[in-house]
């Protein structure tokens, strides 16, 4: 059976998580993919999400989240800047294959953000607004809305094939919370 | 517990070739990308190869490309590197590992297996 | 191609003191940096990654930090088994993925 298993980040306030997902590209080029927070007991919460069909390169933002799908790599590179402590939690890359249920990657992540910055000197990371700045094409995608038969308890699901899709609820306007990657498929 | 095991190395003439085999274990092996990391005798590491998980993607260092050849077979949890054209600078302990299931970085290796290229 | 450059290249350090290693990267990698250990005639051994962030298994003593092209792993206080060779690693985005120079630490 295939065992999920999570990598933890532990980042401080302000910094900027950066993870990539690995997905095989003859399949998944050009589907949809997502971002997703998972809480205990609940169905997974889609944060953000590709344009469909995805587009190359081509960076999507999502409040705080910005997602680039390079179909050339097979890779989805997921950024959540200026991190908050209450971005904590669980996160999932998954891939959206209508009717099918959401294929998820691996791993998942396990994000920890502490207080206080703790740039060194020399760093020029300590102003995330001056290090990221979004192309004005950036767009914000629509996300479909999934809501998975199956029911989600706190256990990790056991196999791909039993992975539980995201709900149908985001706030595009309000979506400040966490993000979290997994990668190599 | 996951266990990665090299082999293959030996000796080899210059402008010959070898195949180095990599055993994988206590993972999901088509989960997650693998890679080549080599170290000349006495010097530092430098990354080879990687390829990804479903092995539709690979990547390689300027200074093996078109020589070196990186492959896996899923069925089998088992990477190779099909090592063609081989030069003394080639000569070092090629490290097999596993890639990390979110970024680049490699969490666990082989003890590694030493290639020696000289006539 | 990113440089990665560390310093100092040998630290002598006697057992129970504190060490501190340094990695720059020519340009900004964010966190996305690694540090590893290795012993004579044996495979690396991943210590940090993300920056700050301990592998599994890995002493509380090992701790990293830094962000955008300097950064530090500071071991608290030396053990006899962590005389060794650091190396640190950047992965921000596409390959050549590359390794620091290594920074020997010797019991002083």
């Known amino acids: 059976a295939t065992k999920l298993t999570e990598e933890k980040y532990e980042l401080k306030e302000g910094q900027t998580l950066d993870v990539k997902c690995d997905y095989t590209l003859e399949k998944f080029a050009s589907s949809q993919k997502a971002w997703q927070i998972i809480r205990d007991g609940e169905m997974p919460k889609t944060l953000a999400c590709t344009e469909r069909p995805s587009k190359n390169s081509h960076p999507v933002q999502v409040g705080r989240i910005i997602l680039e799908d390079y179909h050339d790599h097979g890779l989805l590179r997921v950024r959540m800047v200026n991190l908050q402590v209450e971005d904590s939690g669980l996160y999932q890359c998954v891939i959206y294959q209508p009717p099918k249920e959401p294929h998820m990657l691996f791993d998942r992540i396990r994000l920890v953000v502490t207080k206080g910055f703790s740039g060194t000197p020399g760093s020029n990371e300590n102003s995330t607004q001056n290090v990221y700045k979004i192309p004005p094409t950036t767009t914000k995608a629509l996300c479909p809305l999934y809501t998975s038969p199956r029911t989600v308890t706190q256990a990790p699901p056991k196999s791909t094939a039993d992975v539980s899709t995201p709900d149908s609820e985001i706030n595009l306007t309000n979506v400040t919370d966490i993000i979290r990657v997994p990668v190599f498929n | 517990e996951v266990q990665v095991l090299e082999s293959g190395g030996g000796l080899v003439q210059p402008g010959g070739s070898l195949r180095l085999s990599c055993a994988a274990s206590g993972f999901t092996f088509n989960a997650y990308a693998m890679s080549w990391v080599r170290q000349a005798p006495g010097k530092g590491l430098e990354w080879v190869s990687t390829?990804?998980?479903?092995?539709?993607?690979?990547y390689y260092a300027d200074s093996v490309k078109g020589r070196f050849t990186i492959s896996r077979d899923n069925s089998k949890n088992t990477l190779d590197l099909q090592m063609n054209s081989l030069r003394a600078a080639d000569t070092a302990v090629y490290y097999c590992?596993?890639?990390?299931?979110?970024?680049?970085?490699?969490?666990?290796w082989g003890q590694g297996t030493l290639v020696t290229v000289s006539s | 191609e990113i440089v990665m450059t560390q310093s100092p290249a040998t630290l002598s350090v006697s057992p129970g003191e504190r060490a501190t290693l340094s990695c720059r990267a020519s340009?900004?990698?964010?966190?996305?940096l690694a540090w590893y250990q290795q012993k004579p005639g044996q495979a690396p051994r991943l210590l940090i990654y993300g920056a700050y962030t301990r592998a599994t298994g890995i002493p509380d003593r090992f701790s990293g930090s830094g962000s955008g092209t300097e950064f530090t792993l500071t071991i608290s206080s030396l053990q006899s088994e962590d005389f060794a060779v650091y190396y640190c690693?950047?992965?921000?985005?596409?390959?050549?993925?590359?390794f620091g120079q290594g920074t020997k630490v010797e019991i002083k």
């Open positions: 590992a596993k890639v990390a299931g979110s970024n680049f970085f490699f969490d666990h």
């Open positions: 690693q950047e992965f921000i985005m596409w390959p050549p993925w590359t």
């Open positions: 340009q900004s990698i964010n966190v996305n």
């Open positions: 390829i990804s998980g479903s092995g539709s993607t690979t």
